[in-house]
């Protein structure tokens, strides 16, 4: 049979932040290209990136339809310039990657603090809302429409002339804490999903602190 | 002020589907809280269903969940409850709440504020 | 699932007394994810307390909340008669949330 020369990928990995999902493999092509197919456990194979010299293969426009099903998918090896070859046993060769589930598996973006404001001993900071790819009645949903409660904030805070931090945690977006009338403020917040097993947290969002150029309200 | 109203059928047969409606007013089902159902088995004490975000986002009682759906209908500012399979051990008085933030220790937390009266569901042919 | 025990099943109390309500937790409650509710015959629970400690709106005062991990107390400082009713502990921290047996405030 013609597939002499095509070897089956490997190391096949999921990559996924906020539910944009890019299946990666090895290895680069020589004289081979791929073709990638997903489905749930209960469904038909849908193919993706037909041929294609990457190897890489976005399947973000196939997870988000449900995010909580979970996926499998496959990457066929065919040589070059004859994609119709198969292997001794009748089909191309190809290798299964790991099974995926959006929901529990994505990891959660870096969190970005939208806004602070300062009245008297009481400081709100807000945590800006970020937008995913999953659609919702030909809208893009929030990683809060999505996530609901199972997604909680940590605040971590501490005065900008000590390093001793303090901590608050929230089921919005939103925190209120009460701090020293005068000091200035330095802060960062962390996305977390308790329940899950897994990619549970984010990175930490960029440090904000009180008092600098931006002033004391930033939008 | 919100109020909530359940409504559906009082009687349902064994094997069937219950299915029950909660309308909200006097505010916007997608003003940032979540929708719960409960329920109270006669004479006993209280049982969470599960909840719903305006966006479509659902948790359920994992003792439930293979029979429950629970979906919104922002245009009609209703949520409702549909459980597959009933026996007699479904029957219960079903009661709908929102789940609104209130400010606790730094952050925000949800609590159910506001409920339904209560509608009595009984399973029997 | 958590397992909230509430105690004791009934209290038998006069007006004017002081209430305490226990609820115990088969493992810990973050403080920002217990309430309390009050239900009377044929009505909806009332929500009296949230983050263990914190009144509801409209709330009167002799209701108070304490306590923390597994051990959580309501205490209703002076009975009034429309106090009598279920008292019931809630967690909203874990799912499935969970609900205690409830304690029934019965006139002496």
């Known amino acids: 049979s013609g597939t002499t020369n095509t070897v089956a990928a490997y190391n096949l990995t999921w990559k996924s932040t906020n539910f944009k999902t890019i299946l990666e493999w090895e290895p680069k092509p020589v004289n081979q290209v791929y073709t990638v197919q997903i489905s749930t456990k209960s469904g038909d194979w849908k193919s993706k990136c037909f041929y294609t010299t990457d190897t890489e293969c976005d399947l973000t426009d196939e997870i988000v339809k449900d995010v909580k099903q979970t996926y499998l998918a496959r990457v066929f090896s065919y040589p070059a310039g004859n994609v119709e070859s198969t292997g001794s046993a009748g089909e191309p060769l190809y290798e299964n990657s790991p099974e995926f589930t959006p929901y529990l598996e994505t990891n959660i973006g870096q969190p970005v603090i939208q806004k602070y404001e300062q009245g008297g001993t009481k400081l709100k900071v807000t945590v800006k809302d970020s937008f995913t790819l999953v659609r919702r009645n030909n809208t893009f949903l929030s990683l809060r429409d999505v996530f609901g409660k199972d997604l909680i904030y940590t605040l971590y805070y501490w005065k900008s002339s000590s390093s001793g931090k303090k901590t608050a945690k929230t089921n919005t977006n939103e925190f209120l804490i009460d701090v020293d009338k005068g000091e200035n403020y330095c802060f960062s917040v962390q996305a977390v999903i308790p329940s899950r097993t897994v990619n549970r947290k984010s990175t930490d969002s960029p440090v904000e602190c009180m008092g600098q150029e931006k002033g004391e309200f930033r939008e | 002020q919100v109020q909530l109203q359940e409504s559906g059928p009082g009687l349902v047969k064994p094997s069937q589907t219950l299915s029950l409606t909660c309308t909200v007013s006097?505010?916007?089902?997608?003003?940032?809280?979540?929708w719960s159902w409960i329920r109270q088995h006669p004479g006993k004490g209280l049982e969470w269903i599960g909840e719903?975000?305006?966006?479509?986002?659902?948790r359920y009682n994992p003792s439930l969940k293979s029979r429950v759906t629970i979906s919104v209908d922002t245009s009609k500012n209703q949520f409702s409850l549909k459980l597959s399979s009933v026996t007699a051990a479904d029957t219960a008085v079903y009661y709908c709440?929102?789940?609104?933030?209130?400010?606790?220790?730094?952050?925000?937390?949800?609590?159910?504020?506001?409920w339904g009266k209560g509608t009595t569901v009984t399973v029997s042919s | 699932e958590i397992v909230l025990t509430q105690s004791p099943g009934t209290l038998s109390l006069s007006p004017g007394e002081r209430a305490t309500l226990s609820c115990r937790a088969s493992?810990?409650?973050?403080?920002?994810?217990l309430a309390w509710y009050q239900q009377k015959p044929g009505q909806a629970p009332r929500l009296l307390i949230y983050?263990?400690?914190s009144r509801a709106t409209g709330i009167p005062d002799r209701f108070s909340g304490s306590g923390s991990g597994t051990d959580f107390t309501l205490t209703i400082s002076r009975l009034e008669p429309e106090d009598f009713a279920v008292y019931y502990c809630?967690?909203?921290?874990?799912?499935?949330?969970?609900f205690g047996g409830g304690t029934k405030v019965e006139i002496k």
């Open positions: 983050g263990a400690s």
């Open positions: 809630q967690q909203v921290g874990v799912v499935p949330y969970t």
């Open positions: 006097g505010g916007s089902i997608s003003s940032g809280q979540y």
């Open positions: 719903i975000y305006y966006s479509g986002s659902t």
């Open positions: 493992q810990s409650v973050s403080s920002s994810y």
């Open positions: 709440a929102r789940d609104t933030p209130y400010y606790y220790d730094g952050g925000y937390y949800y609590y159910m504020d506001v």
